[in-house]
């Protein structure tokens, strides 16, 4: 018969490394008479027996984790007690060895230029992982501005443009790697103008082109302001290049103005301006020049606007003390005296009254005003208006004018200058260039003058010309 | 036939003063913008100076304060007075009628400074 | 001063044959208000005075024959001689209207 003989634990616990989800064993061997009980303990609390995530076999002896988690990492210990002498127990640790593993990815990030970015990357991993970030395929190195945290986040200082891209963090131990998706830093620059538009003093009438160009992310918007509110007339032409949008006005010059430019973008609810102004001034023009007698400018009224080109510039009688006003005055008065006149005349004297009293400017020294042809009168006075002419010269001598119809707008034919003389001098009359080119008979003309004088407009192959070359001085 | 005669060309010693004249013919002188434009030995052509129909006158810098366009519509005449002349201002002086084109050219009067 | 850049300096050609001389201004010479281009060109015979050839880029003046015409726009003009003749030999100067005037510095043209 065996004596009794109090437990000895012959192999102590060691200290055990698992992986998470394998298998841990902890061997208790004990050698005692009669056989032990042999209880298990983690962190001194009681593992019972029928806890399914562990096996205990060999009467105790075998304690096996069937599938590790990393929360069962602690001291396990066994105690085995017979009833002979005092329970022994012997405790070893588990050390739950963990791949890495990337609890917290970055994320995408929008951020504006010059401000702090930091990009997450939380672990879990035994051994603790490293943590390294790549941008593009290229490991990003650490400076003064960019540093990887403890934690492992990505904070980058003073976001610069050349910042944006694709990152991802890899976390590493010796049990391997873990990488988190790509993520993408956006960086968000404020609507900066590369070049500003550049004053121009300019002759008058003449097109400028103002330039400019700002960049941005996202890129910018342009706008132009001229004299504080939006450009009314000129065409802009944009261009977009590498995050640099290129600007230009073309515009008309008649008047001095203050343009700005103003670039603008959004960073999320807020947006960024930036702003740049460039005057346009008109270049001095000579003393003599404003001693003449009036400016020039953009015809705005509405009589002579069929008549008159688009956009035409007009001289206006600076004798009047508004002359724009005064002249549509004249003009809206003199209309009003040619409802009486025939069809074929009436169009006629619109044409030659409008160019009379808006005369069009042309440029050289300066912008000034040009007459119409003497050619182009004659031919209103002498055929297309003979018999209304020759009315009104009979009122007129009569004195029947007095109530300040005299100042009726009708030019002096014999005191303009001919095309022939220079074909530069004076305007011409387009109306009349069409009409002389489509009428083929001509009521009976009761000339003031004999027929002789009768125009002979340039290049007539009508019945229009129904004189020989008219000789004029 | 429209006819401009220049005459009052000369030489001249440097710092002189010479005054050029130009009789038009041919045409209503007083509806007219008048020219001078000179041309210097082999040179090219250079514009002086523009007289408009109110006797308003206009100047290339290079002679400005120098040199005074006038007209005269009753004699229809135009004259162009050349003051404080220097070496450079050597040059064939042409009376031009024209307003935007320089239509109808004199046959020019020399002018020569040189002392 | 708009500065008017003319090119070549000289051309030899013989009769028949057709001529282009070009003439380059420094800033746009055509006028917003009426498109007009403000450029002239001018024919100067030995020992004669300059007579207008061409106005406004493209209009003739009157008595100047049909083989010349002039053309272009903006800044770049061309007069054109179609069929050269003895008589054309001279020198041709462009000039400028849209500011103070200004000519470029002319082309001799030889008939061989």
């Known amino acids: 018969e065996k004596l009794p003989k109090a437990p000895v634990i012959t192999t102590p616990l060691e200290t055990v490394d698992a992986l998470v989800e394998e298998v841990a064993t902890f061997m208790c061997a004990v050698e005692s008479y009669p056989q032990p009980e042999i209880s298990w303990t983690r962190n001194k609390i009681l593992i019972k027996l029928f806890d399914t995530r562990y096996s205990i076999r060999e009467n105790g002896q075998l304690l096996t984790i069937l599938s590790v988690e990393d929360s069962d990492d602690g001291i396990y210990c066994c105690i085995a007690n017979n009833g002979v002498g005092g329970a022994v127990e012997s405790c070893g640790a588990l050390q739950v060895k963990m791949k890495p593993k990337i609890t917290r990815p970055p994320i995408n990030v929008k951020i504006i230029e010059g401000l702090k970015a930091v990009l997450p990357c939380t672990t879990m991993g035994n051994p603790k992982p490293s943590v390294s970030w790549i941008k593009g395929d290229n490991a990003l190195r650490e400076n003064s501005r960019i540093a990887v945290l403890e934690s492992g986040s990505l904070r980058i200082h003073n976001v610069q443009k050349e910042d944006a891209g694709q990152y991802r963090c890899v976390a590493k131990n010796s049990l391997g790697t873990a990488y988190s998706k790509l993520v993408k830093l956006e960086v968000e620059v404020f609507a900066r103008i590369l070049r500003a538009p550049e004053s121009h003093n300019v002759t008058f009438g003449s097109f400028v082109t103002l330039r400019c160009t700002a960049i941005g992310i996202p890129v910018p918007t342009i706008s132009w302001i001229e004299n504080g509110n939006a450009v009314s007339s000129g065409s802009i032409q944009e261009s977009v290049k590498d995050r640099v949008i290129d600007s230009r006005l073309q515009l008309f010059i008649t008047k001095p103005g203050l343009y700005t430019c103003i670039a603008t973008n959004k960073h999320g609810e807020k947006f960024s301006t930036a702003k740049a102004a460039a005057t346009v001034s008109i270049a001095e023009w000579s003393k003599s020049q404003k001693d003449s007698q009036g400016y020039c400018a953009q015809y705005r009224g509405e009589v002579c606007d069929a008549v008159l080109a688009k956009d035409a510039l007009v001289f206006f009688n600076t004798s009047y003390r508004d002359p724009e006003d005064a002249q549509e005055l004249l003009i809206h008065t003199a209309w009003n005296e040619l409802k009486a006149v025939s069809p074929l005349c009436r169009p006629a004297a619109e044409a030659l009254l409008c160019n009379h009293l808006f005369q069009e400017c042309s440029p050289g020294v300066v912008p000034t005003p040009m007459p119409i042809c003497r050619e182009y009168c004659l031919a209103v006075k002498e055929l297309f208006c003979a018999k209304e002419w020759q009315a009104m010269e009979g009122k007129a001598h009569r004195g029947l004018y007095r109530s300040g119809m005299h100042l009726l707008p009708v030019p002096e034919c014999s005191k303009l200058p001919s095309m022939h003389r220079d074909p530069t001098a004076c305007t011409r009359l387009p109306y009349l260039d069409y009409k002389k080119e489509n009428i083929t008979t001509f009521p009976s003309i009761t000339s003031s003058r004999p027929s002789a004088d009768i125009p002979n407009l340039p290049a007539s192959t009508s019945s229009f010309a129904v004189s020989p070359a008219y000789s004029m001085t | 036939e429209v006819q401009l005669v220049e005459s009052g060309g000369g030489l001249v010693q440097p710092g002189g003063s010479l005054s050029l004249s130009c009789v038009a013919s041919?045409?209503?002188?007083?509806?007219?913008?008048m020219n001078w434009v000179r041309q210097a030995p082999g040179k090219g052509l250079e514009w002086l100076s523009v007289i408009d129909t109110h006797s308003i006158a206009y100047y290339a810098d290079s002679v400005k304060g120098r040199f005074t366009i006038s007209r005269d519509n009753v004699k229809n005449t135009l004259y162009l007075q050349l003051n404080n002349l220097k070496p450079e201002d050597t040059a064939l002086y042409y009376c031009?009628?024209?307003?935007?084109?320089?239509?109808?050219w004199g046959q020019g009067t020399q002018v020569t400074v040189s002392s | 001063d708009i500065v008017m850049t003319q090119s070549p300096s000289s051309v030899t050609a013989s009769v028949g044959e057709k001529v282009t001389i070009n003439c380059k201004s420094s800033q746009s010479v055509v006028f917003g208000s009426n498109q007009k281009s403000y450029l002239n060109w001018y024919q100067q015979r030995p020992g004669q005075s300059p007579r207008l050839l061409i106005y406004?880029?493209?209009t003739q003046e009157s008595g100047i024959p049909d083989r010349f015409s002039g053309s272009g726009s903006t800044t770049d003009f061309t007069l054109t001689i179609s069929s050269v003749q003895p008589e054309d030999a001279a020198v041709y100067y462009c000039q400028q209207a849209y500011s103070a005037p200004t000519f470029g510095s002319g082309t001799r043209l030889e008939i061989k």
């Open positions: 031009v009628l024209g307003r935007t084109a320089l239509v109808r």
């Open positions: 406004y880029a493209s």
């Open positions: 041919g045409f209503t002188f007083s509806l007219y913008y």
